[in-house]
């Protein structure tokens, strides 16, 4: 069977340039390692916002330079994006790799379109 | 841009041994997902095997597992392919091919190919 | 695993015909995460389409994929001379990686 990746179709990032959303994965089998990739797709580029390998179970971990936090309950993975700014609002994509053992499976989210608007400076105060 | 270069094919003769190199650039090397795929002259496409992007995890295909081995070396951005026991059906020209970034399996550059002859 | 059958196993057409290739699964495994490959004699292959409808940079316009879950079609809208070629569907979304047997469309 195909994998089913869900993820929420819309996001508003809050004031401080954060999005959160929870990417949910149905597995074929009983994966003992999960990588969880976010792809954010402009135009017909795709370029990787950050990525994960977790053991099931185990927290999830990103790079210590990645703009992205995250943690794993079972099947679902609840992901939460950093620094973003107007010019990063874009479809963001879950992609869910079972990567042990094999059989080797993958499915990809629709994405979720991050809408992110750059907080109005504050005015002088005389 | 993406560049992939197969070398290391020959005429080796059936039990023997032979490893294919394949150089990369133009790219991460690292972040990718790389295969090596090989097609029999007149026939059609043969996945072989795969590595994952920290070289962790390889899978094979069933006519492989136990006598090919996939590795590399991301520091000198090259894939291999070490192939033992060799036979009669493995003549092939071998293709190095690197996993696409939406999904690994797809295979979005290709190098040109190199000839591998099982022959006594 | 998951078996792909590509029919027919020869279309002969002329420059300007449209042209209909079927890829067929054995399982549903696959969904949508179907690929089309174009192979001309002496070289590697191209990837024309990927997720079954997406076309791949620099893929002209005339080529187009369709489909989801058993069935998939590839349809070049308008055959130019350099189309002619042997074409494989391939799936991804579960290990094996498994590809058809190719159609090769040729110039009648």
């Known amino acids: 069977k195909a994998m089913h990746v869900a993820q929420p179709a819309v996001v508003l990032a809050n004031s401080r340039g954060t999005a959160s959303f929870v990417c949910e994965y149905a597995s074929p089998g009983k994966a003992t390692e999960v990588r969880v990739t976010v792809l954010r797709q402009a135009d017909s580029q795709v370029t990787e916002v950050c990525a994960a390998t977790y053991m099931m179970g185990n927290e999830l971990t990103f790079l210590d330079d990645s703009i992205c936090t995250g943690t794993s309950s079972g099947n679902q993975v609840n992901l939460t994006i950093q620094g973003l700014r107007a010019m990063d609002t874009g479809l963001y994509i879950c992609k869910v790799e079972l990567m042990y053992p094999p059989p080797y499976y993958m499915g990809i989210g629709n994405g979720t379109q991050i809408y992110v608007i750059d907080p109005e400076p504050c005015p002088d105060s005389d | 841009q993406v560049q992939l270069v197969e070398s290391g094919g020959g005429v080796v003769q059936p039990g023997r041994s032979l490893r294919l190199s394949c150089a990369a650039s133009g790219f991460t090397f690292s972040s990718y997902g790389m295969h090596w795929v090989r097609q029999a002259p007149g026939k059609g496409l043969e996945w072989v095997a795969v590595i994952w992007y920290d070289g962790n995890n390889k899978y094979y295909a069933d006519s492989v597992k136990g006598r090919f081995t996939i590795s590399r070396d991301n520091s000198k951005n090259t894939l291999y392919l070490q192939m033992y026991s060799l036979r009669a059906e493995d003549t092939a020209v071998y293709y190095c091919?690197?996993?696409?970034?939406?999904?690994?399996?797809?295979?979005?550059?290709w190098g040109q190919g190199t000839l591998v002859t099982v022959s006594s | 695993e998951i078996v792909l059958t590509q029919s027919p196993g020869t279309l002969s057409l002329s420059p300007g015909d449209r042209a209909t290739l079927s890829c067929r699964a054995s399982?549903?495994?696959?969904?949508?995460?179907l690929a089309w490959y174009q192979q001309k004699p002496g070289q590697a292959p191209r990837l024309l389409i990927y997720g079954a409808s997406s076309r791949a940079t620099g893929i002209p316009d005339r080529f187009s994929g369709s489909g989801s879950g058993t069935d998939f079609t590839l349809t070049i809208s308008r055959l130019e001379p350099e189309d002619f070629a042997v074409y494989y569907c391939?799936?991804?979304?579960?290990?094996?990686?498994?590809s058809g047997p190719g159609t090769k469309v040729d110039i009648k």
């Open positions: 391939q799936q991804y979304g579960t290990s094996p990686f498994t």
């Open positions: 091919a690197r996993g696409g970034i939406l999904a690994a399996g797809i295979f979005d550059y």
């Open positions: 399982q549903s495994g696959s969904s949508s995460y």
